[in-house]
């Protein structure tokens, strides 16, 4: 029986009965928050062989091993993951071993086994036989291995039953528990699974099989399952579903959801039955099961029941996330906020059409309206009194409407009104009239030339750069000395710069009146010598990174015709020089024969330029004599099992942490202080743990249903 879609067992251990007839869990399996220690010995689910998503165990008191619960769990597919993990075992206070002795394959994702104070038999499992890549596994804060004394079957009797593999240069027996070996298939099978008798399964099998070379005898399928057979691809008129089986159109049409309406049911796209059209596609009509590509961003119509949506905070803007067409009116009233411009762009940046009017008033936090970066049409189907469809009143810091060189905005019906916007130049408003097609609609009082732009440098001259020099982490720029009509009106210059991977930034990007600004700012005083051109050295930059830079002259206010005369440059794009890349990551080496080494690595996190090749160096090392001093055939006295507290030790502390023998005749000395890199790594590690724990808690703690 296929169970799903996802099973959550919590609070009451008797809920485990829900798994009774499951052979495949289509979705996830959560077993968590069972605080009363119970006897799980009567619970056994031998039918369960596959979990298509992930397995999560969290705070289940009294459970000592998973082997009795799931003796035949063979594959966890990881089609969807829990924070990148397909197997999570977290804060399982009584778990002594994992014991999933039939687990042969975790198809996607890593494992996270953390803060399990009594958990042993972790170093005896070779996860590389189960997962493709072990580098992302996270196994910390469990019982220290030296307190476990993990023994594989037969070791004490000197008749070892398990096979050996090498992990971290340690060649050892591999087992799940004191009486269960880790199964390994003969090398002749290659990547194929095998039966209990070591016969190779059919190539389409995954994990195991009941008969050799038979695609109907697989425990799980490598690709897809259809009508009792493992197939490499779904046959005609069937569709991939949940990453593991083939279903027909009727099946797909009959999947229900409590979250969405029946007209938003599953769709068939690109040979797959899926919950919704993928990014960039939309349903081919409201009653269709099929997807077609969107032209531009996919449309999402949002409607306000009260006709007018007031945006007075990030929270209210959040309701418009993803909307491309807004049916109603927008009233923007942002008086304060943190990082408001980029937050608004995040939530309102896709809006293309507003069917009613747009009113911006008392929005003192706004410097620009560029957060509405895709607005192209205001229909004006509903207008404010006086027939206004675009109304801008009393915005003390508004300096820019949009970047009209890169913006087409049409106002289909209605007039514009602008008043009491002291930093908004009238020329900017006139430009909007031309672009939007509203020129001639406004009457004289609709655009007030006295109280718009009264405190702005509206008649701007252009500053020209004269030279630029770059190194790997510095840029030197100079520009023409600006000479206003009265030299005393020039106070200083401000240089603005930021990383700009693409040449599409504007002066007002990410800028608001509450201090948030995506640009770095540096003040540059006037050179005392009137003939010297002003300039600046920007340092601490990243190698091989494109920066955008512009300069503004800072001038005294109220100069000509009661308006400020100012100057600024165009935006200059400039790239720093290349530099030495950081070290390649995750270097792994393994020997696959007596004369070969296979070395793998990931690219450096900071390439600092275009990588063209890698240099691999190697040298022969003398054999370490220490390896011969110990008789590895004798098993030393097994350490006493001491209960660990489940906290995470960053390092194992010796008896006397203050003194370490530092070699030679130096005698005892203090432990070496941690390097900055080590401290940073520890800090990041702790941060990563916190992020995961928050994610876990946020995912699993839900309010009780009423």
């Amino acid at each position: 029986e296929i169970c799903g879609p996802g099973i959550d067992i919590r609070n009451d251990y008797q809920q485990l009965k829900r798994l009774e007839n499951c052979t495949v869990i289509e979705g996830y399996l959560h077993i968590l928050l069972i605080s009363k220690a119970e006897d799980y010995r009567s619970y056994r689910f031998p039918k369960l062989t596959v979990i298509t998503e992930y397995l999560l165990l969290f705070r289940v008191a009294g459970l000592e091993s998973l082997g009795d619960l799931f003796p035949n769990l063979t594959v966890i597919r990881g089609w969807k993951l829990f924070y990148n993990y397909a197997l999570v075992i977290f804060e399982m206070t009584n778990l002594k071993d994992i014991g999933l002795y039939n687990l042969r394959n975790i198809t996607r994702g890593a494992i996270r086994i953390e803060k399990n104070a009594d958990l042993c038999y972790l170093s005896t499992v070779d996860w590389s036989l189960i997962l493709d890549a072990v580098s992302n596994n996270y196994i910390v804060g469990n019982k220290p291995p030296k307190e476990c004394g993990d023994l594989c079957p037969g070791t004490m009797e000197e008749k070892p039953m398990c096979e050996k593999t090498t992990i971290n240069n340690e060649y050892n027996y591999r087992c799940w528990t004191t009486n269960r070996c880790q199964k390994m298939c003969p090398s002749t099978c290659g990547k194929r699974a095998c039966t209990e008798n070591n016969e190779c399964c059919h190539p389409e099998c995954l994990g195991s099989c009941s008969a050799p070379d038979n695609d109907t005898a697989c425990v799980a399928c490598r690709h897809y399952y259809y009508a009792g057979v493992c197939v490499p691809a779904c046959p005609p008129n069937t569709y991939r579903f949940e990453g593991w089986r083939c279903v027909d159109r009727d099946f797909c049409a009959n999947i229900l959801s409590a979250e969405s309406s029946d007209s938003e049911g599953f769709v068939i796209h690109d040979g797959e039955c899926m919950q919704e059209c993928p990014s960039g596609f939309i349903r081919n009509g409201s009653q269709s099961m099929y997807c077609i590509p969107c032209e531009g961003p996919c449309p999402k119509v949002c409607e306000e029941e009260k006709k007018t949506k007031t945006i007075d905070s990030v929270t209210s803007a959040q309701m418009l996330q993803g909307c491309t067409i807004f049916k109603g009116n927008l009233l923007i009233n942002i008086r304060r906020g943190n990082n408001i411009a980029s937050e608004l762009e995040n939530f309102m940046g896709l809006i293309e059409v507003v069917t009613g009017y747009v009113k911006i008033r008392h929005s003192h936090a706004l410097v620009s309206l560029s957060f509405l970066k895709n607005l192209r049409l205001i229909l004006g189907e509903e207008q404010l009194e006086g027939n206004y469809s675009f109304y801008v009143l009393d915005n003390q810091n508004l300096q820019q409407l949009w970047d009209w060189d890169h913006r087409n905005l049409t106002i289909k019906a209605g007039k514009m009104y602008f008043a009491f916007n002291p930093k908004l130049c009238v020329s900017e408003i006139y430009r909007m009239e031309e672009v939007t097609g509203t020129k001639g609609r406004q009457s004289k009082g609709d655009i007030n030339t006295r109280n718009n732009g009264e405190r702005a440098s509206c008649e701007s001259d252009v500053l020209h750069f004269t030279s630029t020099t770059t190194s790997k982490n510095r840029i030197i720029i100079t520009w023409h000395r600006y000479r206003p009509p009265d030299y005393r009106d020039l106070i200083s210059f401000t240089v603005y710069y930021k990383e700009a991977p693409f040449k599409n930034v504007t002066e007002y990007d990410g800028q608001d009146a509450c201090g948030s600004n995506s640009w770095n700012m540096v003040d540059v005083d006037l050179p005392p010598n009137k003939d010297v051109e002003p300039g600046i050295l920007l340092h601490g930059l990243k190698p091989w990174t494109q920066y955008a830079v512009y300069v503004k002259a800072v001038t005294l206010t109220m100069v000509e015709n009661d308006h400020i005369r100012g100057a600024k440059s165009e935006i200059l794009y400039i790239r720093t020089n290349a530099s030495v890349p950081s070290i390649p990551l995750d270097v792994l080496s393994a020997s696959n024969s007596s004369s070969q080494l296979i070395v793998k690595w990931n690219p450096p996190s900071l390439p600092n330029g275009n990588l063209s090749y890698y240099i691999v160096r190697w040298q022969r090392q003398p054999q370490d004599g220490y390896l011969y001093r110990h008789n590895y055939c004798s098993k030393d006295k097994i350490p006493i099992r001491k209960y660990a507290d489940g906290t995470i030790d960053i390092e194992e502390v010796t008896e006397n942490p203050k003194t370490e023998v530092c070699g030679g005749e130096k005698g005892p000395c203090c432990a070496c202080p941690k390097t900055e890199a080590e401290k940073q790594a520890e800090k990041e590690e702790a941060e990563y743990r916190k992020v995961f724990e928050n994610f876990l808690h946020n995912s699993i703690f839900v309010p009780r249903p009423e």
Partner: antibody
Framework: EVQLVQSGGGLVKPGGSLRLSCAAS????????MHWVRQAPGKGLEWISV???????YYADSVKGRFTISRDNAKNSLYLQMNSLRAEDTAVYYC????????????WGQGTTVTVSS | EIVLTQSPGTLSVSPGERATLSCRAS??????LHWYQQKPGQAPRLLIK???QSLSGIPDRFSGSGSGTDFTLTISRLEPEDFAVYYC?????????FGQGTKVEIK
């Protein structure tokens, strides 16, 4: 011929249990969502539960926690396990496949009577 | 849950006349509304699906209209076999719900 044949109704005491069955034929049972609908004597239709093709189950508030819908695709059968029965559960129970956006197919069982009385 | 309210509760019409039945939803359900006919001792029979889509085998005197919250079933000329109880049913959101029914009787 597409049909649904019901069984399992009868007289039961309050607090008792009963299991209704519905056997499907003439269509690919596993590819369709299946519903239970009931009708109390002289009253209107009341939707009570559905199980979709994945096995996901949904219930009306009036039966949540007491009734369990399940299916066995190998046997082409739909079930309704009714526990903690009350007098107000007395009704004719229908199993049905209700059409959806993409199909007009709408199939109902003949109905089976459940009487809850002491 | 979405509540469906049918009106009138009973409709008395003469054969050959037109009958108009109404169904109102407590919130917008798009076009996910269906009309059923039920005769005594029988299981319901689907007449109209998704507000206005007719089904094969159903006489074309039955038609449906509406979307959002207001829906109508129209029987253009009542035949003797049309006297029955009519139910609307929404499938837009789970749990599904039925209206309380409209009884169409001979005047």
């Amino acid at each position: 011929e597409v049909q649904l044949v019901q069984s399992g109704g009868g007289l039961v005491k309050p607090g008792g249990s009963l299991r209704l069955s519905c056997a499907a034929s003439g269509f690919t049972f596993s590819s369709f969502a299946m519903h239970w609908v009931r009708q109390a004597p002289g009253k209107g239709l009341e939707w009570i539960s559905v199980i979709d093709t994945r096995g996901a189950t949904y219930y009306a508030d009036s039966v949540k926690g007491r009734f369990t819908i399940s299916r066995d695709n190998a046997k082409n059968s739909l079930y309704l396990q009714m526990n903690s029965l009350r007098a107000e559960d007395t009704a004719v129970y229908y199993c049905a496949h209700l059409g959806n956006f993409y199909y007009g197919m709408d199939v109902w069982g003949q109905g089976t009577t459940v009487t809850v009385s002491s | 849950e979405i509540v469906l309210t049918q009106s009138p509760g009973t409709l008395s019409v003469s054969p050959g006349e037109r009958a108009t039945l109404s169904c109102r939803a407590s919130q917008s359900i798009g076009s996910s509304l269906h009309w059923y006919q039920q005769k005594p001792g029988q299981a319901p029979r689907l007449l109209i699906k998704y507000a206005s889509q007719s089904l094969s085998g159903i006489p074309d005197r039955f038609s449906g209209s509406g979307s959002g919250t207001d829906f109508t079933l129209t029987i253009s000329r009542l035949e003797p076999e049309d006297f029955a109880v009519y139910y609307c049913h929404q499938s837009s959101r789970l749990p599904h719900t039925f209206g309380q029914g409209t009884k169409v009787e001979i005047k």
